[in-house]
Amino acid sequence: VKMAETCPIFYDVFFAVANGNELLLDLSLTKVNATEPERTAMKKIQDCYVENGLISRVLDGLVMTTISSSKDCMGEAVQNTVEDLKLNTLGR
Amino acid sequence: EICPAVKRDVDLFLTGTPDEYVEQVAQYKALPVVLENARILKNCVDAKMTEEDKENALSVLDKIYTSPLC
């Protein structure tokens, strides 16, 4: 998904939460210097995915993928790329 | 930078009502099974998390959005 390239750490954390992998979540949260209370809060969200099973994780992953690859986001990504190109060109 | 539509989805997941969150998801995927799952997850999060927990989760999101990795 193109959007994952624009904010990889968000998708790292999201998929760690949705997959129910506590170790992966800890590693991802370390990258953004999350505090202990912040980690506890994210683990509570993760618990909901774990409790509702594999289908729940797959379906919510589908939602995130759909939103991220929607016109709303892809239009944004294209716009950002155009802006970056303008800045790079002007900066030379 | 995170896409505003994704940011809105996550914000509503934490701070919106179940109806607001499900309505947001429905704009992208109308499958009943997907929307029922969205409501179940939202209700679970609302039941498990205190206001303080939600503030902490939002704080993590702020750190994510301002991270060099985003």
Epitope: K71 | E23, P32, V33, R39
Partner: antibody, heavy 125, light 107 residues
Framework: QVQLVESGGGVVLPGRSLRLSCAAS????????MYWVRQAPGKGLEWVAV????????FYGDSVKGRFTISRDNSKNTLYLQMNSLRAEDTAVYYC??????????????????WGQGTMVTVSS | DIQMTQSPSSLSASVGDRVTITCRAS??????LAWFQQKPGKAPKSLIY???SLQTGVPSQFSGSGSGTDFTLTISSLQPEDFATYYC?????????FGPGTKVDIK
């Protein structure tokens, strides 16, 4: 056989209210999502609203949001559309329709299969 | 909202002709597309769902194809009862939206 019969249409003044009903028979009403779709005279079809089996989820078309309310009474096998603050542009034939899928994860979900014959609503002063 | 467009808006054909109607979505709707037939003064009739699956009782001269943004309804051999208006509709996300319709009349 499977049947949907709408009623409650008529002529109404702008700003007033009207409630449409759709009586279902020949199937387990409580197992299906139900819809309202309308068609203005000489125009195309416009999706109005949907309601879940148990009423837990309801969604509306942009033009009716905040004015129309979809509901159902599974004990009476009846679908309703409460229409408030009616406008001239709400003049249309209103159809109720049944969802195609009632189990599993198939791609038949959300597609309409059975339609009622329609009831005419005229909003005019 | 997803915009649906249909072409042509009308066409004239003879009994036995092969007729093709196209429908385009303004964004990806996967295969969440339905086709309906409507005759004057009557309720719409469901023909196809999931882009290519025939509703129960629909004659085999009707077929649908496509995925993503481009879809086609084909009537392999037009019958006298097939003269009507045909609508496509997306049901990938809310609000559901219909195409403007294609009127098929007798040449």
């Amino acid at each position: 056989q499977v049947q949907l019969v709408e009623s409650g249409g008529g002529v109404v003044l702008p700003g007033r209210s009207l409630r449409l009903s759709c009586a279902a028979s020949g199937f387990t009403f409580s197992s299906y999502l139900m819809y309202w779709v309308r068609q203005a005279p000489g125009k195309g079809l416009e999706w109005v609203a949907v309601i879940w089996y148990d009423g837990s989820n309801k969604f509306y078309g942009d033009s009716v949001k905040g004015r129309f309310t979809i509901s159902r009474d599974n004990s009476k096998n009846t679908l309703y559309l409460q229409m408030n603050s009616l406008r001239a542009e709400d003049t249309a034939v209103y159809y109720c329709a049944r969802d195609n899928g009632n189990s599993g994860y198939e791609d038949s979900w959300n597609a309409f299969d059975i339609w009622g014959q329609g009831t005419m609503v005229t909003v005019s002063s | 909202d997803i915009q649906m467009t249909q072409s042509p808006s009308s066409l004239s054909a003879s009994v036995g002709d092969r007729v093709t109607i196209t429908c385009r979505a303004s964004q990806d709707i996967y295969n969440y597309l339905a086709w309906f037939q409507q005759k004057p003064g009557k309720a719409p009739k469901s023909l196809i769902y999931a882009a290519s699956s025939l509703q129960t009782g629909v004659p085999s001269q009707f077929s649908g194809s496509g995925s993503g943004t481009d879809f086609t309804l084909t009537i392999s051999s037009l019958q006298p009862e097939d003269f009507a208006t045909y609508y496509c509709q997306q049901y990938n996300n809310y609000p559901f939206t219909f195409g403007p319709g294609t009127k098929v009349d007798i040449k």
